[in-house]
């Protein structure tokens, strides 16, 4: 008996071939001997089966001795043994129809779980293997689960169902909803304008939700909400903003925040959360602000940084085009009685200068 695998919702063509290459009488029946379709001369006739409105054949092939049964919009319950009667012969074809669906929605938040459920006909024992867009393979039976979805899991998942050494392939498009970056750091000199950007890693037709930026300043004992906003069809509207600092927010995506001035009291870490309509859970992006200040008070030249810096970072004070006068892996350095000239305060790591502030020391007369 020939086995054919079909996909729910698809169209399948079951073949039946006569030895004579001409149009002769044929019938297709199901396992209950109920007629599905056949012919009367050059006319297609249909029986009382449940497939009535979804069954068809190809009249153009009859003259060649081919009498296919075409079933459209396949259903799991179409799984059956189909019998083609032609020239006093019976050709049996076993059709097995499978369906593969994602648990709820195909748009899932980063960190959530994806469950794929296989619908299969009674008595079948298929195995399923799915390959994610980033090449991750998962195997299972009736259900497959992937916990902790990552951004790289966005895209087309290809799943192969194996039964009776035959296979059928499903493609499911999954969109992982996340920000492009989990974390970012902005380095600014005191007084500079600060731009925070929160680009999303996905595009959807309509995007609606609400968000908030909580900020933990290094100098503060507790965190506070800096801004709350709504998102409606990709349009951003501010609901509430603190008086200090007075953040400004862009009206369009990507989410964009402007802090008019970088000040030591603002240095710290923030967490932007975005709750999307009809989704449980929130998207998160961490943002960090490091602020540098160089000052001269009487005979003391000081450079300080505030904010979440790596302990490997080096803070240096140097006179332009000269060796560093002082370098420390600390958050403040100073020089007593600095000589006149342009001094540079540098915050650097193993690969680059991250932040630089210049201060002019005038000669003392």
């Amino acid at each position: 008996k020939k086995v054919v695998l079909g996909k729910k919702g698809d169209t399948v063509e079951l073949t039946c071939t006569a030895s004579q290459k001409k149009s002769i009488q044929f019938h297709w029946k199901n396992s209950n001997q109920i007629k599905i379709l056949g012919n009367q001369g050059s006319f297609l006739t249909k029986g009382p089966s449940k497939l009535n409105d979804r069954a068809d054949s190809r009249r153009s092939l009859w003259d060649q001795g081919n009498f296919p049964l075409i079933i459209k919009n396949l259903k799991i319950e179409d799984s059956d043994t189909y019998i083609c009667e032609v020239e006093d012969q019976k050709e049996e074809v076993q059709l097995l129809v499978f369906g593969l669906t994602a648990n709820s929605d195909t748009h899932l938040l980063q960190g959530q779980s994806l469950t794929l459920t296989l619908e299969s006909p009674p008595g079948s024992s298929p195995s399923v293997q799915c390959r994610s867009p980033r090449g991750k393979n998962i195997q299972g039976g009736k259900t497959l689960s992937v916990s902790q979805l990552e951004l790289q899991d966005s895209g087309t998942w290809t799943c192969t169902v194996l039964q009776n050494q035959k296979k059928v392939e499903f493609k499911i498009d999954i969109v992982v909803l996340a920000f492009q970056k989990a974390s970012s750091i902005v380095y600014k000199k005191e007084g500079e304008q600060v731009e925070f950007s929160f680009p999303l890693a996905f595009t959807v037709e309509k995007l609606t939700g609400s968000g908030e930026l909580w900020w933990q300043a290094e100098r503060a004992s507790s965190s506070k909400s800096w801004i709350t906003f709504d998102l409606k069809n990709k349009e951003v509207s501010v609901k509430r903003v603190t008086q200090d600092p007075k953040l400004q927010m862009g009206k369009k995506l990507p989410l964009h925040l402007t802090l008019p001035q970088a000040l030591p009291q603002y240095a710290g870490s923030g967490n932007l959360t975005l709750a999307l309509e009809a989704k449980t859970g929130k998207l998160h992006q961490e943002v960090n602000l490091v602020v540098m200040r160089a000052t001269q008070l009487q005979k003391n030249l000081t450079c300080e940084v505030w904010g979440p810096t790596s302990p490997k970072l080096m803070l240096s004070l140097k006179l332009e085009n000269k060796e560093a006068k002082v370098s420390k892996r600390e958050k403040a350095v100073w020089v007593l009685n600095p000589e006149a000239g342009m001094w540079q305060c540098l915050l650097s790591d193993s690969g680059q200068v991250l932040l630089e502030s210049n201060i002019k020391v005038l000669p003392t007369w």
Epitope: S310, M314, S350
Partner: antibody, heavy 122, light 107 residues
Framework: QVQLVESGGGVVQPGRALRLSCAAS????????MHWVRQAPGKGLEWVAI????????YYADSVKGRFTISRDNSKNTLYLQMNSLRAEDTAVYYC???????????????WGKGTTVTVSS | DIQMTQSPSSLSASVGDRVTITCRAS??????LGWYQQKPGKAPKLLIY???NLQSGVPSRFSGSGSGTDFTLTISSLQPEDFATYYC?????????FGQGTKLEIK
């Protein structure tokens, strides 16, 4: 392509000195911190030293502090490790590696040389 | 200096198994941890940096998690080419320190 090639290894007596070199190609050498990492026969990896992109800062493992000196010549795209007062326990394969530093937040050694073998034996 | 304790020191597993290796720091290193794979006679290869970031070209069956003092490397479904020695490295502060390694062998 991006490549690091170590040289200068060999057999040396305890108390003597040796200088290892690491020739870099395929990238802007002067924009990266560089490391030396070693591995004694049959043992695990041991971090030895780092030098910053401009040579301004150098840090060492306690086991080599005061005996080894890391240096670089950015005009020659070359990293060095001067090893003085060598001991039997310095016997190892010495690897040089490039450090990527992003945003002062993400750090990793993404490119490694194949290693050069140093044997300290009398 | 920061000490890194890796466990287990050796591990036997089969192709297709899910494997977890842990690394513990003697003090808070935030997320300053990387994972490296080494095969006999070869240089180490970077797998994961800054706790959970997959290095370009590394198969997605490798993943990292943790923060503070406790970190994990997970291989979701072992492949024949994954049998090697794995090291964690704290790059949070100088001097950098490696864990003692975990040798992953075929069962």
């Amino acid at each position: 392509q991006v490549q690091l090639v170590e040289s200068g290894g060999g057999v040396v007596q305890p108390g003597r000195a040796l200088r290892l070199s690491c020739a870099a190609s395929g990238f802007t050498f002067s924009s990266y911190g560089m490391h030396w990492v070693r591995q004694a026969p049959g043992k695990g990896l041991e971090w030895v030293a780092i030098i910053w992109y401009d040579g301004s800062n150098k840090y060492y493992a306690d086991s080599v502090k005061g005996r080894f000196t890391i240096s670089r010549d950015n005009s020659k795209n070359t990293l060095y490790l001067q090893m003085n007062s060598l001991r039997a326990e310095d016997t190892a394969v010495y690897y040089c590696a490039r450090e990527v530093a992003l945003e002062g937040y993400y750090y990793y050694m993404d490119v490694w040389g194949k290693g050069t073998t140093v044997t300290v034996s009398s | 200096d920061i000490q890194m304790t890796q466990s287990p020191s050796s591990l036997s597993a089969s192709v297709g198994d899910r494997v977890t290796i842990t690394c513990r720091a003697s003090q808070d290193i935030r997320n300053g941890l990387g994972w490296y794979q080494q095969k006999p006679g070869k240089a180490p290869k970077l797998l994961i940096y800054t706790t959970s970031n997959l290095q370009s070209g590394v198969p997605s069956r490798f993943s990292g998690s943790g923060s503070g003092t406790d970190f994990t490397l997970t291989i979701s479904s072992l492949q024949p080419e994954d049998f090697a020695t794995y090291y964690c490295l704290q790059d949070y502060n100088y001097p950098y320190t490696f864990g003692q390694g975990t040798k992953l062998e075929i069962k």
